[in-house]
Protein backbone atom coordinates (compact mmCIF):
# COMPACT_ATOMS: atom_id res chain seq x y z
CA UNK A 1 0.00 0.00 0.00
CA UNK A 2 0.93 3.84 0.09
CA UNK A 3 -0.34 6.46 1.03
CA UNK A 4 -2.01 9.52 -0.58
CA UNK A 5 -1.06 13.59 0.74
CA UNK A 6 -0.31 16.82 -0.36
CA UNK A 7 2.97 18.38 -0.63
CA UNK A 8 1.39 21.87 0.84
CA UNK A 9 -2.32 22.61 1.81
CA UNK A 10 -2.84 26.61 1.77
CA UNK A 11 -5.39 27.81 4.07
CA UNK A 12 -6.87 31.80 4.52
CA UNK A 13 -6.22 32.96 8.86
CA UNK A 14 -9.50 32.10 10.23
CA UNK A 15 -10.49 29.19 7.17
CA UNK A 16 -10.52 25.53 8.47
CA UNK A 17 -7.82 23.28 7.29
CA UNK A 18 -8.16 20.11 5.75
CA UNK A 19 -4.87 17.86 6.52
CA UNK A 20 -5.26 15.16 3.90
CA UNK A 21 -3.81 11.11 4.66
CA UNK A 22 -5.42 8.34 3.02
CA UNK A 23 -4.18 4.85 2.77
CA UNK A 24 -4.14 3.28 -0.99
CA UNK A 25 -3.79 -0.66 1.00
CA UNK A 26 -4.43 -3.88 -1.09
CA UNK A 27 -6.92 -6.01 -0.89
CA UNK A 28 -7.24 -7.18 3.25
CA UNK A 29 -5.10 -4.50 4.70
CA UNK A 30 -6.65 -2.63 7.77
CA UNK A 31 -5.86 0.56 9.25
CA UNK A 32 -5.48 0.28 12.97
CA UNK A 33 -4.56 4.37 13.45
CA UNK A 34 -3.61 7.46 12.08
CA UNK A 35 -1.73 9.44 14.05
CA UNK A 36 -0.61 13.35 13.48
CA UNK A 37 1.77 15.49 14.72
CA UNK A 38 3.25 18.56 14.34
CA UNK A 39 7.25 17.84 13.44
CA UNK A 40 9.25 21.67 12.50
CA UNK A 41 12.35 21.37 11.84
CA UNK A 42 14.60 21.84 15.32
CA UNK A 43 11.74 20.87 17.64
CA UNK A 44 10.62 17.38 19.10
CA UNK A 45 7.44 15.99 17.22
CA UNK A 46 4.23 17.14 19.03
CA UNK A 47 1.14 14.88 18.23
CA UNK A 48 -2.20 16.83 17.30
CA UNK A 49 -4.15 14.05 17.02
CA UNK A 50 -5.04 10.21 16.96
CA UNK A 51 -7.41 8.65 14.93
CA UNK A 52 -8.14 5.15 15.97
CA UNK A 53 -10.29 2.56 14.13
CA UNK A 54 -11.96 1.66 16.95
CA UNK A 55 -11.98 4.18 19.36
CA UNK A 56 -12.57 6.84 17.69
CA UNK A 57 -10.80 10.73 17.00
CA UNK A 58 -8.18 11.68 20.17
CA UNK A 59 -6.90 14.81 20.31
CA UNK A 60 -3.92 16.55 21.93
CA UNK A 61 -4.96 18.98 25.07
CA UNK A 62 -3.16 21.53 23.17
CA UNK A 63 -5.19 21.32 19.91
CA UNK A 64 -8.93 20.47 22.00
CA UNK A 65 -12.32 22.10 20.14
CA UNK A 66 -9.80 22.91 17.22
CA UNK A 67 -9.29 19.24 15.45
CA UNK A 68 -11.79 17.47 13.73
CA UNK A 69 -12.85 14.19 11.12
CA UNK A 70 -13.82 15.51 7.84
CA UNK A 71 -17.49 14.58 7.82
CA UNK A 72 -19.30 11.52 7.03
CA UNK A 73 -19.01 9.49 5.26
CA UNK A 74 -15.97 8.62 5.78
CA UNK A 75 -13.80 5.32 4.68
CA UNK A 76 -12.00 3.96 7.29
CA UNK A 77 -9.07 4.23 5.33
CA UNK A 78 -9.08 7.80 5.00
CA UNK A 79 -7.05 9.77 7.89
CA UNK A 80 -7.65 13.24 6.82
CA UNK A 81 -8.13 15.46 9.64
CA UNK A 82 -9.70 19.25 9.60
CA UNK A 83 -7.84 21.40 11.99
CA UNK A 84 -10.40 24.42 13.06
CA UNK A 85 -9.63 28.14 12.77
CA UNK A 86 -6.17 27.77 11.19
CA UNK A 87 -4.00 30.77 12.83
CA UNK A 88 -0.82 31.97 11.71
CA UNK A 89 1.33 30.20 13.97
CA UNK A 90 -0.53 26.71 12.54
CA UNK A 91 1.99 27.02 9.51
CA UNK A 92 4.86 24.31 9.25
CA UNK A 93 5.30 20.79 8.30
CA UNK A 94 3.05 17.94 9.50
CA UNK A 95 3.26 14.35 9.55
CA UNK A 96 0.90 11.59 9.03
CA UNK A 97 1.50 8.17 10.61
CA UNK A 98 -0.53 5.27 9.52
CA UNK A 99 -0.21 1.96 11.35
CA UNK A 100 -1.88 -0.59 9.23
CA UNK A 101 -1.99 -4.64 9.64
CA UNK A 102 -0.41 -6.55 8.07
CA UNK A 103 1.74 -4.14 6.08
CA UNK A 104 2.76 -2.07 8.68
CA UNK A 105 3.62 1.57 9.17
CA UNK A 106 3.61 4.68 6.47
CA UNK A 107 4.04 7.94 6.70
CA UNK A 108 4.34 11.32 5.27
CA UNK A 109 4.81 14.71 5.55
CA UNK A 110 3.01 17.77 4.11
CA UNK A 111 3.36 21.51 4.92
CA UNK A 112 0.47 24.15 6.28
CA UNK A 113 0.88 27.44 4.91
CA UNK A 114 -1.51 30.07 6.24
CA UNK A 115 -1.83 33.11 4.32
CA UNK A 116 -2.93 36.33 6.20
CA UNK A 117 -4.81 38.79 3.85
CA UNK A 118 -3.45 42.24 4.50
CA UNK A 119 -5.62 45.50 5.79
CA UNK A 120 -3.80 47.89 3.98
CA UNK A 121 -4.22 51.44 5.06
CA UNK A 122 -3.34 55.04 3.02
CA UNK A 123 -1.73 58.10 4.64
CA UNK A 124 -1.86 61.34 2.40
CA UNK A 125 0.84 63.42 2.62
CA UNK A 126 1.35 66.90 3.58
CA UNK A 127 -0.82 69.66 1.70
CA UNK A 128 0.09 69.71 -1.33
CA UNK A 129 0.36 73.35 -3.35
CA UNK A 130 0.97 74.28 -6.62
CA UNK A 131 4.48 75.52 -7.11
CA UNK A 132 5.97 72.74 -4.43
CA UNK A 133 8.76 70.65 -6.28
CA UNK A 134 8.54 66.64 -5.95
CA UNK A 135 6.23 65.74 -2.88
CA UNK A 136 4.60 62.59 -1.00
CA UNK A 137 0.72 62.58 -2.12
CA UNK A 138 0.40 59.59 0.01
CA UNK A 139 1.78 56.26 1.09
CA UNK A 140 0.15 53.28 1.42
CA UNK A 141 1.02 50.18 3.72
CA UNK A 142 0.02 46.32 3.74
CA UNK A 143 1.45 43.69 5.73
CA UNK A 144 0.53 40.12 5.31
CA UNK A 145 1.84 36.84 4.58
CA UNK A 146 3.27 36.12 2.14
CA UNK A 147 4.16 40.17 1.71
CA UNK A 148 1.79 41.79 -0.41
CA UNK A 149 2.09 43.50 -3.75
CA UNK A 150 1.14 47.09 -3.56
CA UNK A 151 0.36 49.08 -6.46
CA UNK A 152 -1.36 52.40 -7.44
CA UNK A 153 -3.61 53.21 -10.07
CA UNK A 154 -4.18 57.02 -11.12
CA UNK A 155 -4.13 59.06 -13.81
CA UNK A 156 -2.15 61.69 -12.38
CA UNK A 157 1.78 61.46 -13.47
CA UNK A 158 4.04 60.73 -10.73
CA UNK A 159 6.45 58.33 -9.33
CA UNK A 160 6.64 55.57 -6.50
CA UNK A 161 9.34 53.83 -4.65
CA UNK A 162 8.84 50.62 -2.19
CA UNK A 163 10.05 49.19 0.72
CA UNK A 164 9.47 45.90 2.67
CA UNK A 165 10.13 44.97 6.21
CA UNK A 166 10.04 41.39 7.48
CA UNK A 167 8.26 40.09 10.47
CA UNK A 168 9.34 36.73 11.90
CA UNK A 169 5.49 35.72 10.14
CA UNK A 170 4.98 38.38 7.73
CA UNK A 171 5.98 41.28 6.20
CA UNK A 172 4.93 44.54 5.77
CA UNK A 173 4.75 46.76 2.32
CA UNK A 174 4.56 50.71 2.28
CA UNK A 175 4.53 51.99 -1.44
CA UNK A 176 4.41 56.15 -1.47
CA UNK A 177 3.50 58.13 -4.74
CA UNK A 178 5.67 61.36 -5.17
CA UNK A 179 4.52 64.08 -7.70
CA UNK A 180 4.65 67.71 -8.93
CA UNK A 181 1.76 69.25 -7.47
CA UNK A 182 -0.43 71.12 -10.52
CA UNK A 183 -4.02 72.82 -10.17
CA UNK A 184 -5.05 70.04 -12.88
CA UNK A 185 -4.86 66.94 -10.64
CA UNK A 186 -7.56 69.09 -8.17
CA UNK A 187 -10.05 66.52 -7.48
CA UNK A 188 -8.34 63.10 -9.23
CA UNK A 189 -7.90 60.04 -7.67
CA UNK A 190 -5.73 58.08 -6.67
CA UNK A 191 -6.12 54.76 -5.67
CA UNK A 192 -3.78 52.23 -3.49
CA UNK A 193 -3.96 48.64 -5.17
CA UNK A 194 -3.24 45.89 -3.11
CA UNK A 195 -3.19 42.11 -3.86
CA UNK A 196 -2.42 39.01 -2.02
CA UNK A 197 -2.95 35.20 -2.62
CA UNK A 198 -5.39 34.95 0.56
CA UNK A 199 -7.64 38.18 -0.95
CA UNK A 200 -10.01 36.86 -3.31
CA UNK A 201 -10.26 40.24 -5.32
CA UNK A 202 -7.70 42.72 -4.71
CA UNK A 203 -8.53 45.39 -2.00
CA UNK A 204 -8.71 49.03 -3.49
CA UNK A 205 -8.26 52.41 -1.43
CA UNK A 206 -8.97 55.68 -3.05
CA UNK A 207 -7.60 59.11 -1.73
CA UNK A 208 -8.91 62.13 -3.50
CA UNK A 209 -6.19 64.76 -4.50
CA UNK A 210 -6.19 68.28 -3.29
CA UNK A 211 -3.78 70.43 -4.53
CA UNK A 212 -4.10 74.20 -3.13
CA UNK A 213 -3.60 77.35 -5.92
CA UNK A 214 -4.91 80.18 -6.53
CA UNK A 215 -4.85 81.70 -10.19
CA UNK A 216 -4.45 85.18 -11.35
CA UNK A 217 -6.98 87.53 -10.63
CA UNK A 218 -8.74 89.71 -13.69
CA UNK A 219 -11.78 92.04 -13.74
CA UNK A 220 -14.43 92.14 -16.13
CA UNK A 221 -17.01 94.57 -16.98
CA UNK A 222 -15.17 97.46 -18.53
CA UNK A 223 -15.22 95.81 -22.30
CA UNK A 224 -17.64 97.88 -23.76
CA UNK A 225 -15.89 101.14 -22.55
CA UNK A 226 -18.85 103.58 -24.09
CA UNK A 227 -21.39 101.93 -21.60
CA UNK A 228 -19.48 103.26 -18.76
CA UNK A 229 -21.38 107.02 -19.40
CA UNK A 230 -23.45 108.88 -16.86
CA UNK A 231 -26.62 108.20 -16.15
CA UNK A 232 -26.29 104.30 -16.71
CA UNK A 233 -27.80 101.61 -14.86
CA UNK A 234 -26.74 98.45 -14.23
CA UNK A 235 -23.59 98.64 -14.59
CA UNK A 236 -21.15 95.94 -12.45
CA UNK A 237 -17.71 94.87 -12.02
CA UNK A 238 -16.95 91.04 -11.76
CA UNK A 239 -13.65 89.71 -10.10
CA UNK A 240 -12.31 86.68 -12.14
CA UNK A 241 -9.91 83.77 -10.00
CA UNK A 242 -10.40 80.14 -9.51
CA UNK A 243 -8.82 78.26 -6.18
CA UNK A 244 -8.71 75.71 -4.01
CA UNK A 245 -9.67 75.94 -1.19
CA UNK A 246 -12.09 78.67 -3.10
CA UNK A 247 -11.06 81.80 -2.07
CA UNK A 248 -13.01 85.20 -1.08
CA UNK A 249 -13.06 88.40 -2.75
CA UNK A 250 -12.62 91.59 -1.53
CA UNK A 251 -13.01 95.34 -3.35
CA UNK A 252 -11.56 98.69 -2.16
CA UNK A 253 -11.02 101.75 -4.22
CA UNK A 254 -7.67 102.75 -4.56
CA UNK A 255 -8.44 106.38 -4.56
CA UNK A 256 -10.85 106.64 -1.88
CA UNK A 257 -13.71 104.67 -0.23
CA UNK A 258 -16.25 103.25 -1.92
CA UNK A 259 -18.90 105.83 -3.09
CA UNK A 260 -22.16 105.43 -1.55
CA UNK A 261 -24.46 103.55 -3.17
CA UNK A 262 -22.03 100.97 -4.91
CA UNK A 263 -22.84 97.21 -3.40
CA UNK A 264 -20.31 94.54 -3.11
CA UNK A 265 -21.68 90.99 -3.49
CA UNK A 266 -18.84 88.59 -2.99
CA UNK A 267 -16.44 88.72 -6.39
CA UNK A 268 -19.10 91.46 -8.30
CA UNK A 269 -19.19 95.25 -7.50
CA UNK A 270 -22.78 97.05 -8.72
CA UNK A 271 -22.89 100.09 -9.25
CA UNK A 272 -26.00 102.72 -9.10
CA UNK A 273 -26.58 104.92 -12.08
CA UNK A 274 -23.53 106.32 -12.78
CA UNK A 275 -22.27 109.68 -12.23
CA UNK A 276 -18.28 110.73 -12.31
CA UNK A 277 -17.81 110.64 -8.87
CA UNK A 278 -17.99 106.51 -9.84
CA UNK A 279 -14.95 107.40 -11.50
CA UNK A 280 -11.33 106.16 -9.85
CA UNK A 281 -9.29 103.17 -9.29
CA UNK A 282 -11.18 99.82 -8.09
CA UNK A 283 -8.87 96.86 -6.43
CA UNK A 284 -9.87 93.70 -6.28
CA UNK A 285 -8.27 91.57 -3.53
CA UNK A 286 -8.57 87.59 -3.77
CA UNK A 287 -7.76 85.12 -1.44
CA UNK A 288 -7.78 81.58 0.19
CA UNK A 289 -5.61 80.03 2.15
CA UNK A 290 -2.32 79.29 0.59
CA UNK A 291 -2.13 82.76 -1.55
CA UNK A 292 -3.38 86.25 -2.57
CA UNK A 293 -4.03 87.91 -5.72
CA UNK A 294 -5.01 91.36 -6.71
CA UNK A 295 -6.34 93.36 -9.87
CA UNK A 296 -7.43 96.66 -10.21
CA UNK A 297 -9.00 99.20 -13.20
CA UNK A 298 -9.58 102.93 -13.69
CA UNK A 299 -13.19 103.59 -14.38
CA UNK A 300 -13.39 106.91 -16.26
CA UNK A 301 -16.99 107.52 -16.18
CA UNK A 302 -17.96 109.52 -19.38
CA UNK A 303 -20.30 112.94 -20.33
CA UNK A 304 -21.91 111.97 -23.33
CA UNK A 305 -21.99 116.02 -23.98
CA UNK A 306 -18.32 115.99 -23.79
CA UNK A 307 -16.40 115.25 -26.58
CA UNK A 308 -13.45 114.24 -24.94
CA UNK A 309 -11.31 111.11 -25.28
CA UNK A 310 -12.47 108.28 -23.58
CA UNK A 311 -10.24 105.85 -21.97
CA UNK A 312 -10.21 103.05 -19.97
CA UNK A 313 -7.04 101.58 -18.38
CA UNK A 314 -6.22 97.97 -16.94
CA UNK A 315 -3.83 97.04 -14.82
CA UNK A 316 -2.97 93.55 -13.08
CA UNK A 317 -0.91 93.30 -9.87
CA UNK A 318 0.05 90.16 -8.03
CA UNK B 1 2.34 -9.57 28.47
CA UNK B 2 1.38 -5.94 30.39
CA UNK B 3 0.40 -5.98 33.79
CA UNK B 4 -1.47 -2.65 34.97
CA UNK B 5 -2.00 -2.20 38.97
CA UNK B 6 -4.66 0.54 39.80
CA UNK B 7 -4.93 2.62 42.94
CA UNK B 8 -7.05 5.78 44.48
CA UNK B 9 -10.88 4.56 44.43
CA UNK B 10 -12.55 5.12 47.47
CA UNK B 11 -15.94 6.50 48.93
CA UNK B 12 -16.59 10.06 47.87
CA UNK B 13 -19.53 12.83 48.52
CA UNK B 14 -21.64 14.36 45.31
CA UNK B 15 -19.41 17.17 44.11
CA UNK B 16 -16.19 15.60 45.57
CA UNK B 17 -12.93 14.86 43.61
CA UNK B 18 -10.88 11.42 43.49
CA UNK B 19 -7.41 10.79 41.85
CA UNK B 20 -7.09 7.14 39.92
CA UNK B 21 -3.83 5.92 39.22
CA UNK B 22 -2.17 2.66 37.24
CA UNK B 23 1.00 1.10 36.93
CA UNK B 24 2.15 -0.90 34.00
CA UNK B 25 4.80 -3.61 33.98
CA UNK B 26 6.48 -6.02 31.63
CA UNK B 27 6.08 -5.83 27.72
CA UNK B 28 5.33 -1.79 27.86
CA UNK B 29 7.07 -1.27 24.71
CA UNK B 30 4.04 -2.59 22.75
CA UNK B 31 1.43 -0.36 24.17
CA UNK B 32 -0.53 2.34 22.58
CA UNK B 33 -3.72 3.42 23.99
CA UNK B 34 -3.87 3.64 27.96
CA UNK B 35 -7.30 3.92 29.30
CA UNK B 36 -9.96 3.96 31.74
CA UNK B 37 -12.64 1.69 31.36
CA UNK B 38 -15.88 1.66 34.27
CA UNK B 39 -18.55 -0.81 34.61
CA UNK B 40 -21.90 -0.11 37.04
CA UNK B 41 -23.82 -2.30 39.02
CA UNK B 42 -26.01 -4.70 35.89
CA UNK B 43 -24.36 -2.51 32.91
CA UNK B 44 -21.81 -2.38 30.17
CA UNK B 45 -18.51 -1.60 30.90
CA UNK B 46 -17.55 1.65 28.96
CA UNK B 47 -14.48 3.51 27.56
CA UNK B 48 -14.30 6.50 30.13
CA UNK B 49 -11.41 7.93 28.09
CA UNK B 50 -8.10 6.97 26.53
CA UNK B 51 -4.79 9.02 25.23
CA UNK B 52 -2.13 8.07 23.19
CA UNK B 53 1.59 7.71 23.73
CA UNK B 54 1.52 11.37 22.31
CA UNK B 55 -0.94 12.69 24.29
CA UNK B 56 -4.00 12.93 22.62
CA UNK B 57 -6.70 12.33 24.11
CA UNK B 58 -10.95 11.47 24.22
CA UNK B 59 -13.64 11.39 26.62
CA UNK B 60 -17.05 9.78 26.99
CA UNK B 61 -19.58 12.93 26.80
CA UNK B 62 -20.75 12.08 29.94
CA UNK B 63 -17.39 13.09 31.81
CA UNK B 64 -16.40 15.95 29.43
CA UNK B 65 -15.23 18.84 31.55
CA UNK B 66 -14.47 16.71 34.53
CA UNK B 67 -12.70 14.16 34.33
CA UNK B 68 -8.67 14.45 33.19
CA UNK B 69 -6.61 11.81 31.98
CA UNK B 70 -3.06 12.10 32.26
CA UNK B 71 0.27 9.73 31.04
CA UNK B 72 4.02 9.75 32.00
CA UNK B 73 5.06 7.52 29.23
CA UNK B 74 8.51 7.21 30.61
CA UNK B 75 7.31 6.00 33.91
CA UNK B 76 4.67 3.98 32.21
CA UNK B 77 2.26 5.36 34.29
CA UNK B 78 -1.36 6.70 33.08
CA UNK B 79 -3.69 8.87 36.01
CA UNK B 80 -7.38 10.15 36.15
CA UNK B 81 -8.30 12.90 37.78
CA UNK B 82 -11.84 12.96 38.80
CA UNK B 83 -13.74 16.52 39.84
CA UNK B 84 -17.05 17.10 40.49
CA UNK B 85 -18.27 13.53 40.70
CA UNK B 86 -21.93 12.59 40.63
CA UNK B 87 -23.67 9.21 42.11
CA UNK B 88 -23.89 8.05 38.56
CA UNK B 89 -19.70 8.01 38.19
CA UNK B 90 -20.37 4.78 40.94
CA UNK B 91 -18.73 1.78 39.48
CA UNK B 92 -15.54 -0.43 39.39
CA UNK B 93 -13.35 1.94 37.39
CA UNK B 94 -10.47 -0.55 35.54
CA UNK B 95 -6.82 0.53 33.43
CA UNK B 96 -6.86 -0.91 30.17
CA UNK B 97 -3.76 -0.74 27.73
CA UNK B 98 -3.96 -1.43 24.32
CA UNK B 99 -1.06 -3.44 22.27
CA UNK B 100 0.27 -1.68 19.09
CA UNK B 101 -0.09 -5.30 17.68
CA UNK B 102 -3.89 -6.12 17.87
CA UNK B 103 -5.37 -2.09 18.31
CA UNK B 104 -7.52 -3.64 21.14
CA UNK B 105 -7.86 -3.14 24.82
CA UNK B 106 -6.16 -6.25 25.81
CA UNK B 107 -4.49 -5.86 28.85
CA UNK B 108 -6.56 -4.72 32.22
CA UNK B 109 -6.39 -4.08 36.03
CA UNK B 110 -8.19 -5.66 38.48
CA UNK B 111 -10.22 -2.66 39.31
CA UNK B 112 -11.30 -0.26 42.20
CA UNK B 113 -14.18 0.36 43.16
CA UNK B 114 -14.99 4.56 43.23
CA UNK B 115 -18.56 4.62 44.95
CA UNK B 116 -20.14 8.34 44.90
CA UNK B 117 -22.56 9.23 47.81
CA UNK B 118 -24.13 11.39 50.61
Known amino acids: GELETSDVVTVVLGQDAKLPCFYRGDSGEQVGQVAWARVDAGEGAQELALLHSKYGLHVSPAYEGRVEQPPPPRNPLDGSVLLRNAVQADEGEYECRVSTFPAGSFQARLRLRVLVPPLPSLNPGPALEEGQGLTLAASCTAEGSPAPSVTWDTEVKGTTSSRSFKHSRSAAVTSEFHLVPSRSMNGQPLTCVVSHPGLLQDQRITHILHVSFLAEASVRGLEDQNLWHIGREGAMLKCLSEGQPPPSYNWTRLDGPLPSGVRVDGDTLGFPPLTTEHSGIYVCHVSNEFSSRDSQVTVDVLDPQEDSGKQVDLVSAS | EVQLVESGGGLVQPGGSLRLSCAAS????????MGWFRQAPAKQRELVTSISPGGSVRYADSVKGRFTISRDVAKNTVDLQMNSLRAEDTAVYYCAAESERTYYFDSWGQGTQVTVSS
Open chain 2, 26 to 33: GSISSINL
